[in-house]
């Protein structure tokens, strides 16, 4: 698997998308896990609803949310209030039984400031950027929430 880099800014939200073949992964729950070292298991952060038909419902674990568009074939992970310790190597997974297929390897990079982007001109805007050998970069920035604003409809 190639690694896709998603760059975000500390304190803001980062949205990670993992496209997949909706027919091949029909009926399968999905998960988001973190690789903490070169060896060892990928540690589960959050997974989609226990009932596959309800996979569209957003599920939270702390500041990380997951939702699955099973028809369109896109798994979306939202990291809210991104912080330096969120940086790392992650995987989008498709679950079947006790096994898990990797849909995408994702490198989450947390920058202190938009000006820290390596190709920054005057301003850094979200959008796809150039490739780093076997990786490609996406920038995903969303504004900070206003006080009292609810980020998403609360779901369990």
């Amino acid at each position: 698997h190639n690694t896709t880099v998603f760059q975000g800014v500390a304190g803001q939200s980062l949205q990670v998308s993992c496209p997949y073949d909706s027919m091949k992964h029909w009926g399968r729950r999905k998960a988001w896990c973190r690789q903490l070292g070169e060896k060892g298991p990928c540690q589960r952060v959050v997974s989609t609803h226990n009932l596959w038909l309800l996979s569209f419902l957003r599920r939270w674990n702390g500041s990380t949310a997951i939702t699955d568009d099973t028809l369109g074939g896109t798994l979306t992970i939202t990291l809210r209030n991104l912080q330096p310790h969120d940086a790392g190597l992650y995987q989008c997974q498709s679950l079947h039984g006790s096994e898990a297929d990797t849909l995408r390897k994702v490198l989450v990079e947390v920058l202190a400031d938009p000006l820290d982007h390596r190709d920054a001109g005057d301003l850094w805007f979200p959008g796809e950027s150039e490739s780093f050998e076997d990786a490609h970069v996406e920038h995903s920035i969303s504004r900070s929430l206003l006080e009292g604003e609810i980020p998403f409809p609360p779901t369990s």
């Epitope: 330096p84 310790h85 920058l111 780093f132 990786a135």
Partner: antibody, heavy 120, light 107 residues
């Protein structure tokens, strides 16, 4: 065995620039963040910034923005820090320190430090 | 910026004793705190990460505790090689910051 070898001490004049290097060994260079830390004589440690060698993405302490520039050369697996417009306040020991796997959950390995002396 | 207040700044003890060093953050940093040992002529050593996780190769007499704003490094049964400078560091948010240090000297 993981080691971080830093370049030697330098004596520079006020207003000049200096570029120091940090050459790690014993691990895959692009898998771990590299941090730079300042220690003025008899004082505590100050984080300058970090760079992800895989992407070249860097983050700076606001205090050092415009003063320090972090870069990497993946072909030689070497990290660099350049300090510009030097003053006596920049006289210090500068350390490179390796972060964790694609992240910064503590600095597990440190270089021996590069002493920078700014004097006319 | 997150300020880390380390206490005491200076500590004397004898081998075999148990000592504690405190680190207080100006705001909650969850568990994202590390402890380092600094000795002349040696490279700095990471002792504890995530507030309480002992790094491999570090003797079990070193332990860390705490979360939120209050953290403690405990060294039990002090060995002669433990007399050194100790720093706490937060990596919860940018910029990463260090405590002012605690100098542990032999009595």
């Amino acid at each position: 065995e993981v080691q971080l070898q830093q370049s030697g001490p330098v004596l520079v004049k006020p207003g000049a620039s200096v570029k120091m290097s940090c050459k790690p060994s014993g691990y895959t260079f692009t898998d771990y963040y590299m941090n730079w830390v300042k220690q003025s004589h008899g004082k505590s440690l100050e984080w300058i910034g970090s760079i992800n060698p895989y992407t070249g993405g860097s983050s700076y302490n606001q205090k050092f923005r415009g003063k320090a520039t972090l870069t990497v050369d993946k072909s030689s697996s070497t990290a660099y820090m350049e300090l510009n417009s030097l003053t006596s306040e920049d006289s210090a020991v500068y350390y490179c320190a390796r972060g964790s796997y694609y992240s910064n959950l503590g600095f597990a390995y440190w270089g021996q430090g590069t002493l920078v002396t700014v004097s006319a | 910026d997150v300020q880390l207040t380390q206490s005491p700044s200076y500590l004397t003890a004898s081998p075999g004793e148990t000592i504690t060093i405190n680190c207080r953050a100006s705001k909650s940093i969850s568990k994202y705190l590390a402890w380092y040992q600094e000795k002349p002529g040696k490279t700095n050593k990471l002792l504890i990460s995530s507030g309480s996780t002992l790094q491999s190769g570090i003797p079990s007499r070193f332990s860390g505790s705490g979360s939120g704003t209050d953290f403690t490094l405990t060294i039990s049964s002090l060995e002669p090689e433990d007399f050194a400078m100790y720093y706490c560091q937060q990596y919860s948010e940018y910029p990463f910051t260090f405590g002012s240090g605690t100098k542990l000297e032999i009595k």
